[in-house]
Structures are given as structure tokens and as C-alpha cells.
Amino acid sequence: QHTCSISKVTSLLEVNCENKKLTALPADLPADTGILHLGENQLGTFSTASLVHFTHLTYLYLDRCELTSLQTNGKLIKLENLDLSHNNLKSLPSLGWALPALTTLDVSFNKLGSLSPGVLDGLSQLQELYLQNNDLKSLPPGLLLPTTKLKKLNLANNKLRELPSGLLDGLEDLDTLYLQRNWLRTIPKGFFGTLLLPFVFLHANSWYCDCEILYFRHWLQENANNVYLWKQGVDVKDTTPNVASVRCANLDNAPVYSYPGKGCPTSSGDTDYDDYDDIPDVPATRTEVKFSTNTKVHTTHWSLLAAAPSTSQDSQMISLPPTHKPTKKQSTFIHTQSPGFTTLPETMESNPTFYSLKLNTVLIPSPTTLEPTSTQATPEPNIQPMLTTSTLTTPEHSTTPVPTTTILTTPEHSTIPVPTTAILTTPKPSTIPVPTTATLTTLEPSTTPVPTTATLTTPEPSTTLVPTTATLTTPEHSTTPVPTTATLTTPEHSTTPVPTTATLTTPEPSTTLTNLVSTISPVLTTTLTTPESTPIETILEQFFTTELTLLPTLESTTTIIPEQNSFLNLPEVALVSSDTSESSPFLNSDFCCFLP
């Protein structure tokens, strides 16, 4: 018998060699193989020359093969479908010469940082191109000029800051465009040309609403029925358009289509859409989403997520990797919403993990003082500042929703001198206090020492306990320790306060499951100012595996942040699993997406 199983589908001989611990092509492959599955093996490298004698080969699956390089040194004249997803490819060779009949190319979930200008030259038959979940920061001009038959283009979940203005030129057959979850600030004037795109996904970007956004705003208004919110496992044809999913990152997540453009110059031009209107902003509301996440039993591949499940409005966010493999839990998160989104509670089976949430914040340089200063944000009348950001995202071509959460706040009457601009939360009086753990870490040594680690931990889940004190200590490696004390005071109205103490040191790797707070109070913003010569970059690190129960019903809220700290009006942060626990790629200057 063959190493691989053999069958036939639509007149093509199908050979399935998936998950056979192969490090090379099997020697006994049938010569008339039409469909070849080599996924989930340890091939490392692959050359098309090894398949040139398989003249019937039409479909080739090389997904999850730990590929670091692909060589196109042999022509596969009949190959129509090539799946290279979930590998470690950092670059792509030119494909046109070797694969002239290619109609579908899937290179999603790789590590592509860039594409060479001619990488698609010769792929005149290409109809579907999947590049989601890579590290693409830009695209070369003219990338898609050779692929005039392209129907589906997926660029979601990359790090694209801008798009070449003529990217879509000539793509008359294009019907689906995925651009969600990038770092896009605007769309070039005339980008869409005269294309009629039935399905476009644009949410979860850093859209910056100023006069430059007006072309895009008008396009959204004209194409409101073609803009969708991507939902895991749901065919786009079964969903309803959601143009409000495209939000201004710099205007409290107001929908781009309703950006008024006040004060912007008006100009004429049919394709430029400079017919400016004043449309009122849509107020934000909140909903409560209960879910648990799910991963296939047979796979351990978790990757950067591409979009949201059907229960969640897919808001602006950046994706980060986890630090550990998952364990099954059920989680409840609070979600920011705006009118037009229907978000209902839904429970799903889950494999959440022990995550690390890292928020890059750059301390505000100031020549005047080294002491931490606290500013109490003053709520407007009838507004109760509360936690407003939390989300769940899931990848395209995946069944693995992953929970996330972000900023926490402290209760009234609590004082927490913290050597950075950070927002933390502890419970209000409640019969269901929920433990939280937060870690504050400096990235680099500083001549003005500040505590490099501060962890706030509340007790194990209990119906009566609430945290009362916490001590912050500087880790051993600090050369000039400057200890700071943070106290969590028991709220006045707590019915059964039970004092507890948590001594906080540099966190060791931990498997203890910690939980997020379930009740929210007004925001306290604490700002550390330092001399201009000593900018300090810090990370707020929140390790958690969540299991929230009985969240209070939340109302429409606003988080008040002093003007000088307006850079903290951040997009939401998504926590996602991936095949590696390395976090170092996120500690570099490229990780800047919190800034507008």
C-alpha cells in the first residue's frame, strides 16, 4: 500500500499525504496525481522541480509544512491551485514562469514582510490571492497589474500603513476585497476608480479622519451596501452590510462615513467624490458579549487573527501574540458598540490561553518634575466613565475565536502612584470581586530610575473578598531602586471588606489563572513626567486567562482622559494565539499603532 491515501475527485486522482511526518516528497507518488495534499509535514523547503513529472497536477496543498523557502525552478503547467498557508515564508519567489495556469494562490499566515514588484508577473489567470495574516507593511506599485482576472484579494491582518494609489487599476473582475485589520490611515484619492466591488471589508484600521479622508468618506457613502463586517464562519452573502464598521481612530471611533469634514476645502471631480456633506456623528453604546473560544482539537496552529465572529462588532485593533498554549475556559467581555450593530450574547466552546497584553506607551517628556502626578478626570454631567474597550477576533479560514481585553480603571478614593501613564481598574463594592493581575515594566534602563515591575493582584475568586492593599517593589536587577507604594483602598460601601495583601515582584512565568474585573469605576489617569533627556518607554503588561461571570449591565459611557494625555485614546488591542510565544517583534519601533 502507498504511504498516502488515494481517491478520485472530479476526474482527478487525489493523493493525501497530510500529517505523515514527511521531510521530503514521498517516493511512491502516483504519476497521474491531480490533487496532492502535503500539508502538516515538516518539509522545510520545497522546490517545484520535484513535481515537474506530475503532468496532471492541478491542486497542490503545502499548508503547515514549516516552509521557510520555496523555489520555483520547475514548471507545473497544469497547476491551478497552490496553498502555501500557515508556513514561515518571509519572501516569495517570482511565480509566473513556473505556474502559468495558477488561478488561486494562498500565502496567508506566513511571515511575508514585503513583496517584490514582479512577484506576480506572468500570473495572468490568477483569480484569488490570499495574503492575509502576514507582516506586509507596504505593497509595491503595480503589484497586481499582471493579474487582470483577479476576483478575490485578501490583505487583511497585515501592517499596511498605506496603499499604492493604482493598486486596483484594471481589476475589472474584482468582487471581494479584504483590507480589515491593517494600519491604514487613509485611502488614496481615486483608489477605487470606477470599480463596482460587491464585498469590501475595511474595519479595524487606524482611519484618520481629516480633510484627506473625504474621498474615502464619499466612497463609503456611495457604497454603503457593499461594506461588510467580516464574521468567522459566516458566508458574506449571509450577512448584512455594515458601513458603520469603518471608524475614525482619531474621533472616538465615529464612523468614517459620517465624518462632517467641517472646514475642508471643496472641489469638483466625479471620481474624487468631493461632494462634502455634514452628517452627524453616531454616538457609541456598549453591549455585553458572553462567549468562550474554540479551537480544533487536531491542530496547535494559532495565528494572528483576521476578523470578528458573528457576535462581535469588529472594532479598531492591533493583534498581539500569546505567551502560552490554551486551556479551556468561558469568558465574558465588555464590548464597545455603535448603533447599527446587532451584538447578542453567544456562548462558544473555547480554548483560551494565558495571554500577555502589552500596551506601548511613551512617557511624556517634561523639564519640570520627576515626581508622579495624578490627575482625576472629571466626568461630564450624567456620564459615568467606565471600561469601554474589549473585543474578540477570529481569523479567516479558521475556527479559533480568541478573547481579548484592554484598559482598566481604578475606583474612587483609591490612590495608585504609577510611574507611567496607565489606566488600571479594581472592583467597586461588589459581592463578586474578580481577581486581576497587572504588570508594569520598563523596557530600557533609565538614569531616572522608576520601578520596573509593578503587579497588582487581588484574591482568589470569592463572594466576599475585595482587595485592599498592594505593595509595589522594584525588581532585583534595578541598579537604583526607587520603591513606590500603591494602595488599593476598600470602597466605602463594601459590605464585607476582607483585607488582603499582595506583595508584588517581578512576575515569574505563571500558570495561575487570573481574572479581569467585572465592575468598573471612574477613570483615574496617573502621569509620570520626566526630563526631556530621559524619555522612558514602558509596557503595561496584563497577563490573564479570563472567566468572567455576571457582568453588570453597562450603559453608554465615555472614558475621560486629560487633553495632555490624548494619545492614550487608543485603538483596542487584540490578543491572539500564534505558533510562537516570542513577543520581541512587538517591542520595536514598528509597534506604533496606538498613535493616530
Epitope: I6, S7, V9, T10, L12, L13, P30, D32
Partner: antibody, heavy 118, light 113 residues
Amino acid sequence: QVQLVESGGGLVKPGGSLRLSCAASGFTFSSFAMSWIRQAPGKGLEWVSSITSAGTPYYPDSVLGRFTISRDNAKNSLYLQMNSLRAEDTAVYYCARSRGYEDYFDYWGQGTLVTVSS
Amino acid sequence: DIQMTQSPSSLSASVGDRVTITCKSSQSLLNSRNQKNYLAWYQQKPGKAPKLLIYFTSTRESGVPSRFSGSGSGTDFTLTISSLQPEDFATYYCQQHYSSPWTFGQGTKVEIK
């Protein structure tokens, strides 16, 4: 004209073995995929195995590991080696030709009866 | 595996009648690449081997009378005999040739009324 003639059927005990043959004529045998299909008495048709023109065999789960299909293009012959026979293998076994790379059967032999009984 | 279900299992008809036999598959037999439905029909008379009538849902095999026609798409298919002839009394089988294992319907026996 295309002709397919099966032989080798007979009575065999459970656990026994049997080898069926199919002699082909009237067409270029080596260019066509060939198959075995069976029909239990008074029942419907059930596919047993196929072999492509390049010699690649494939089977349904019900016979995988017990039956082996093979061909000898020089002799214009198709074979089915049946081992570990069971009572439920009792049927008329037909040899059939497939059209090109397609998997419908355009010519059939008259069949040979295999009876598995103790 | 793809399951094939034929109905009726038997029917009685007279010469000249229009006869319709249906076949349902448990999954679509439509190949989106070529827009073909991979379904065949066979006729079998007692003591004889099956004979191919139609393949790819509607393509008549050479030598098959034009009164035999096939239609359908996706999961629902029909064999129609427009005017039943004496030699048409037999058992008819549908077969999916979309993906292995190749599977047949249980058969429809057409008898003389």
C-alpha cells in the same frame, strides 16, 4: 468491438482467497482506467476498486487491505486478488471500463459469481 | 461518502407513458471548475450487465435512444423516458462520479402495468 470477459469466480470458504481476471479486447487497454463493481444477489451495485491507466489503484474502505487490483497491459488483462473473504463479499463481480479520466463506466463484462460460504 | 437515494424504488407503467425517476445525492455533484454535474444513469435487465445511458447528468451515450433524457443540478437529478417502450422495462440506477468511492442509487424497477 469492445469486449470484457470475467473469469475466476466460484465457491470459497470465509477467510479464503480468490483471484478474478478480466480479458479485454477491442480497444487500447493501456489507455483506459478499469474497475471492478459487484452486485449481491437481488441487490444494487457496489464499486469495489479501480486502477488508473498509469497503474494507480484505489479502493473503498470496505475492501481496503483485503483486495488488490492490478493490470497487465501486455496481456490486456485486469485482475482482482481477493483475500480474507467474508460472506458479505458474495456477489456477481463485473469488470468495467472508464471513459478517459472520467469515472462512469461505459462498458461492462457479463460478470462472474463469487460465493463465500462455509 | 456520497449517498445516493432513488425514488421510487419501483413503478408500474404502460407502453407510451412518460416515466420520471429521481435521484438525490447527499452532497452537491456540481464541479464549479467546469460547471458539470457528475451523475450517470444505467439500465440493467435481469441476468445482464448494466448499460450506460447518460453521463454528466444529461449527456446521452452514443446509441441510446433520444427518449431517454437526464436533467438536474447540485443534489437533485431526474431521468425521464418520454415514451416508454417495451424494451425499456428494466431496473435503472444512478451513480455519482464526482468523488470516490463511487456510489450508486438502490435502483428503480420499471414494470409493466
